[in-house]
């Protein structure tokens, strides 16, 4: 059964068959033998009942308030009362575009990943047993699918599935005929899945430095939106009032990942800076990496193997 | 109301090579379609010559062209190509385009819903 209205605020195009449908139908029992009342209130009127004898583009049955179909002068707020039971809906009905086969207002948006699943399916459970046939537009152009009452895409997604698709109901009742759009907006994006972050250069640098001079090292990430980057160094950090953390950069990359930079900048550098570990570390759910610094007079660099210096 | 609109055939000799085109007609798209080519000869009956499926990826072709025959698509440019070399006698006759009855390109493809007027091909010298 098709679920009931629970949403207090619907915006819907006119022209269209529409309907209410009240969320305490379950209690089948009560509704056959109590007084069921349907109001609407708008501008000027205050509470108005409905009934069939009220407009013939409205039908009343059990649980539902059906518009066949609904126009620009039916927004307004409607009631359902029962017993001491009430729900309350607004309705703003909005102009159909009559120069799209959709209005831009009623459109779902959705992310598909590029490669991942990608479906559309068009189906409308209340107006099922009427529907004669169902189109699937991309972009406004038809596409010629061979099921007709249920037409359906399943693929995996390339960037070019992206676009609009209207799913378009045609309906029997009464002798007339009437359609109903639902319109997707599909945005194709890159892979979103996790990365192993990587620290970028070398695991171990060498940086030869002058005493009493100013470094600045670098340290460079490949992440994802979530991992965090940072340095570890001394006994305890922030011990030292001549080094500095800068501020974290942040660059994200085409494919959807952050390119990372976190400066440590040592100023007045002292014999204590020499020769002791400078760490940076990325850290993920999928784990760390690091890498090291070490200062070294320049009077030794001579000492080191060259492959190893960073300058 | 035409969908579907050949083109491409005409009078060429044994041994010769054509190109068909299956493109969609203004306001729809062929890029979810699985498509078929088919051909009817006089007195004949219609015979499934090759199919290709939406993605490009699944293609078909009848025993009497494997070989000379090649079937693409531009979904782009909303069209399906039949590449013909190595043409016979035999393979004079209307050819035309259509979707696929049962959403699926196979050695039992079956016409669907959809379909072109066709596009005359003889073979002849």
């Known amino acids: 059964a098709e679920s009931c209205t629970s949403r207090p605020h619907i915006t819907v195009v006119e022209g269209e068959p529409f309907y209410l449908k009240h969320c305490s139908c379950s209690l089948a029992h009560e509704i056959e033998t109590t007084t069921k009342s349907w109001y609407k209130s708008s501008g000027s009127q205050e509470h108005v009942e409905l009934n069939p004898r009220s407009s013939s583009r409205i039908a009343l049955h059990d649980c539902v308030l059906e518009f066949w179909p609904v126009e620009l002068n039916d927004t307004g707020s409607y009631f359902f009362q029962m017993k001491n039971y009430t729900q309350k809906w607004k309705l703003n009905v909005i102009r159909r575009n009559k120069h799209s086969c959709f209005t831009e207002r009623q459109v779902t948006s959705k992310i598909v990943e590029v490669k991942k699943f990608f479906q559309i399916t068009c189906e409308n459970s209340y107006y099922q047993t009427l529907v004669n046939s169902t189109s699937l537009y991309k972009n406004c152009k038809k596409l010629l699918l061979e099921n007709n009452k249920n037409p359906t895409i399943k693929k995996n997604a390339e960037f070019e599935d992206q676009g609009y698709y209207s799913c378009v109901h045609f309906l029997h009742h009464n002798g007339k005929l009437f359609n109903i759009t639902k319109t997707f907006n599909i945005t194709i994006v890159e892979d979103r899945s996790n990365i192993v972050p990587v620290l970028l250069g070398p695991k171990l640098n060498h940086v030869a430095v002058e005493l009493g001079k100013n470094v600045r090292l670098n340290c460079s990430a490949l992440l994802n939106e979530e991992d965090v980057i940072y340095w570890m160094f001394g006994e305890e950090n922030g011990s030292d009032p001549n080094i500095h953390e800068e501020k974290e950069m942040r660059i994200m990359t085409p494919e959807g990942k952050w390119h990372a930079s976190k400066v440590l900048r040592i100023e007045n550098i002292g014999e204590s800076n020499l020769n002791v570990l400078y760490n940076c570390t990325v850290a993920s759910t999928g784990g760390t990496d690091t890498k090291s610094f070490i200062l070294v007079r320049k009077a030794d660099m001579a000492d080191i193997p060259g492959h190893v210096f960073t300058r | 109301e035409v969908q579907l609109v050949e083109s491409g055939g005409g009078l060429v000799q044994p041994g010769g090579s054509l190109r068909l085109s299956c493109a969609a007609a203004?306001?729809?798209?062929?890029?979810?379609?699985?498509i078929g080519w088919f051909r009817q000869a006089p007195g004949k009956a219609r015979e499934g010559v090759s199919c290709?499926?939406?993605?490009?990826?699944?293609?078909y072709y009848a025993g009497s062209v494997k070989g000379r025959f090649t079937i693409s698509r531009d979904n782009a440019k909303n069209t399906v190509y039949l590449q013909m070399n190595s043409l016979k006698p035999e393979d004079t006759a209307v050819y035309y385009c259509?979707?696929?009855?049962?959403?699926?390109?196979?050695?039992?493809?079956?016409?669907?819903?959809?379909r072109g007027q066709g596009t005359q091909v003889t073979v002849s010298s």
């Open positions: 259509a979707t696929l009855q049962g959403d699926v390109c196979t050695n039992t493809f079956m016409s669907g819903s959809y």
């Open positions: 203004s306001g729809f798209t062929l890029v979810y379609s699985n």
């Open positions: 290709i499926s939406s993605s490009g990826e699944v293609a």
